[in-house]
């Protein structure tokens, strides 16, 4: 779909003639008709094909033609076509006399016809204008024309449409040869497809409008490349959804059981050693001067007792220092200036000469220690107490105060995690290397099956004759809620028809 | 009113020549086009061509090209259609026509001219 | 060259009754969504006169009883209520190519 347009610009008759040589009076009062048709090697006779136009009268004689397409006039004269322009054209123009208002054929004097033209060619669609001129023996006449497309027709033959858009349907406006330009932010053959935000993942996240991300379920994050782990995963990350990999140190299905209590925590004090030994459980290793279970306790040094033979101890800001009781020397009262001949052995020990009698060694009784048997054994010295038990002396045996999840006579053995059947509502406990796992009966869920879920009962349509179930969450069952007509538990029996029992 | 008034019955022998005119009156003579159309005795009818009277453009049947020529004298609004090399099958009545460009078709007709070609 | 054939030869029809006539082209007439197609009544002892352009457009002083349609190749002229002074030979015509060529004519008489 198309226009022809035509431009006339100069008319000239100077002697104010008809086409028959007769002159006009006063003159010659001139209109045009046009004619476009399809192209003829010979112009003939026959229908404008491409459409005919008339003008009012525009001047007299001669007369430059005012351009009045500003002002919604005739100039230049449209000729619409509603096909494909076929680029080649013939076109006939007359000049007319009118001496009166009325234009119409038969309205005018038998010899009116002024001058006439025929012109054949070819002619592409475009913006620029052809000028021409045409002579005949007493006029002449100077136009120009030119094809262009009608809005929303594009290419060569005005046979492209396109409709520039932005909506649902497309987001485009259209090139010079018919073709979609998808405006900022939207591709694909319409333009409805929009550019997501630069980064977005490809599989993992899309948009609705330009420079959106939107995630699928299980993934998050502006460019939605992020995976989202499972619900409840403690310390522990994902590489797709829904996954729990748990943390260094950490265990259990939502990676919450800590198998790294000493990282974590720093239970020991005082720059004590840490040991790991299972869940949550861990040994501290005493430095020199302190005691208890993480350490914490700050022994004097004298309470070791270091000095030996009845020395008695003095403590020091750096140290401490043992007074030796007479026959005795050294830093810790270990050597002595005594012999068997002077009775050191204490507590029923028995007395030995060494180096020809220079020095001698007590053989000490049960429950008796230290050079001269001076000492009473105190059991708990070499902290036999595992997993951090609290060593304790009983008259001449020693027994372990063990930690929760402790037992045996060294606190060595682990209690059964599922000993104290910490799973709820029936469910199953797993014991596992780092803690336990609880398998939840149908209804149950949670890490101790402590939360009901409610099993819709009604999910396999139990109820007949298009009755309404409604599940009782209290006892997981359903109820049938019968419509008018029908009876039984899943409204099965018509009322009146009584149900046939197989006894 | 509008009038194409034609010359009057022609018999020709073989071999000759026949010049037939066609005066129009009542409307602008150059602006139309001028047809001759040919009827055999109790036949149908054969277009033979036409001439444009304003720029003299002529357009002939294959048939009748080589023997028909048309000319016009616009001075005088008369158009002229010449048939030479006259055979018996040429006895014929012979129309003009007025057409136009703004196709109403062959509204106005002569009333014909008869032409006899007999030895 | 368009060969134009019309049917029926001739058609004898009562006063006041329909009369059809046929018109068939060897190729289409159309052009620009514009039929070359005319009618033409002729009487006898004068020349044929217009009654139908375009297929279907009436010419001037034509009476409302004839009617033309078609496009394409095929073609039909109508007298819808046949009169006396309608008795006449009647010619199809095409003039999309040179040369014009018309129907072999159909002669309409009263029954």
């Known amino acids: 779909s198309g226009v022809f347009q035509l431009q006339l610009q100069e008319f000239i008759n100077e002697r104010g003639v008809l086409a028959s040589g007769r002159p006009c009076e006063p003159g010659c009062r001139t209109f045009f008709r046009v004619c476009l048709k399809h192209f003829q090697a010979v112009v003939s006779p026959g229908p404008c094909t491409f459409g005919t136009v008339s003008t009012p009268v525009l001047g007299t004689n001669s007369f430059a033609v005012r351009d009045d397409s500003s002002g919604g006039g005739r100039n230049p004269l449209q000729l619409p076509f509603n096909f494909t322009w076929p680029g080649t054209f013939s076109l006939i123009i007359e000049a007319w006399h009118a001496p009166g208002d009325d234009l119409r054929p038969e309205a005018l004097p038998p010899d009116a016809l002024i001058s006439k033209i025929a012109i054949q060619g070819s002619l592409a669609v475009g913006q620029n204008w052809l000028l021409d001129e045409q002579t005949s023996t007493l006029t002449r006449l100077r136009y120009s024309y030119r094809v262009i497309c009608s809005d929303n027709y594009y290419g060569d033959n005005c046979s492209r449409l396109c409709k520039k858009r932005n909506d649902h349907f497309g987001h485009y406006v259209c090139q010079p040869d018919g073709n979609l330009s998808c405006l900022p932010g939207w591709t694909g053959e319409y333009c409805q497809q929009p550019i997501c935000l630069s980064g977005c993942h490809e599989q993992n996240g899309y948009c609705s409008k330009p420079a959106e991300c939107l995630c699928r379920p299980g993934w998050q994050g502006r460019l939605c490349n992020e995976c989202i782990p499972h619900n409840g995963c403690r310390h522990g990350t994902c590489s797709t959804p829904w996954q729990c990999t748990c943390d260094e140190g950490w265990g259990g299905l939502f990676c919450d059981q800590d198998l790294n209590y000493c990282t974590h925590h720093s239970p020991c004090k005082n720059g004590a050693t840490c040991s790991n030994s299972g869940q949550r459980s861990y040994t501290c290793t005493c430095r020199p001067g302190y005691t208890g279970v993480d350490c914490e306790l700050e022994l004097s040094e004298c309470d070791s007792n270091p000095c030996r033979n009845g020395g008695s101890c003095k403590d020091q800001e750096d140290g401490y220092h043992c007074l030796c009781p007479p026959g005795y020397y050294g830093l810790h009262c270990e050597h002595s200036t005594l012999s068997c001949a002077d009775s050191p052995c204490f507590n029923g020990g028995s007395c030995r000469e060494r180096n020809q009698g220079a020095n001698y060694a007590c053989e000490c009784p049960p429950n008796f220690t230290g050079s001269n048997c001076e000492k009473k054994v105190d059991r708990c010295t070499s902290n036999p107490c595992a997993n951090g038990g609290q060593c304790l002396n009983r008259g001449p045996s020693r027994m372990c105060r063990c930690r929760p999840g402790f037992t045996g006579t060294y606190c060595e053995l682990h209690v059964s995690d599922c000993a104290r059947n910490p799973c709820a509502h029936g469910g199953t406990c797993h014991d596992l290397e780092n803690g336990l796992m609880c398998t939840c009966p149908a209804g149950f869920s949670g890490r101790r099956c402590e939360v009901r879920t409610s099993i819709d009962a009604c999910a396999s349509s139990p109820c007949f004759n298009r009755a309404t179930c409604y599940t009782d969450l209290s006892t997981d069952t359903f109820v049938c809620n019968c419509p008018y007509g029908f009876v039984g538990s899943r409204c099965e029996f018509p009322v009146g028809l009584p149900p046939s029992f197989p006894w | 009113q509008v009038q194409l008034v034609q010359s009057g019955a022609e018999v020709k022998k073989p071999g000759a020549s026949v010049k037939i005119s066609c005066k129009a009156s009542g409307y602008s003579f150059t602006a139309y086009y001028i047809h001759w159309v040919k009827q055999a005795p109790g036949q149908g009818l054969e277009w033979i061509g036409y001439?444009?009277?304003?720029?003299?453009?002529?357009n002939y049947n294959q048939k009748f090209k080589g023997r028909v020529t048309f000319t016009t004298d616009t001075s005088t609004s008369t158009a002229y259609m010449e048939l030479r090399s006259l055979r018996s099958d040429d006895t014929a009545v012979y129309y003009c026509a007025r057409d136009y460009d703004y196709d109403v078709g062959m509204d106005y007709w002569g009333q014909g001219t008869l032409v006899t070609v007999s030895s | 060259d368009i060969v134009m054939t019309q049917s029926p030869d001739s058609l004898a029809v009562s006063l006041g009754e329909r009369a059809t006539i046929s018109c068939r082209a060897s190729?289409?007439?159309?052009?620009?969504?514009?039929?070359?197609m005319k009618w033409f009544q002729q009487k006898p002892g004068q020349p044929p006169k217009l009654l139908i352009y375009a297929a279907s457009n009436q010419g001037s002083g034509v009476p409302d009883r004839f009617s033309g349609s078609g496009s394409g190749t095929d073609f039909t002229l109508t007298i819808s209520s046949l009169q006396a002074e309608d008795v006449a030979v009647y010619y199809c015509?095409?003039?999309?190519?040179?040369?014009?060529?018309f129907g072999g004519g159909t002669k309409v008489e009263i029954k």
């Open positions: 015509q095409q003039s999309k190519e040179v040369p014009w060529t």
């Open positions: 001439i444009s009277n304003y720029n003299r453009a002529t």
């Open positions: 190729e289409s007439v159309d052009n620009y969504g514009i039929s070359f």
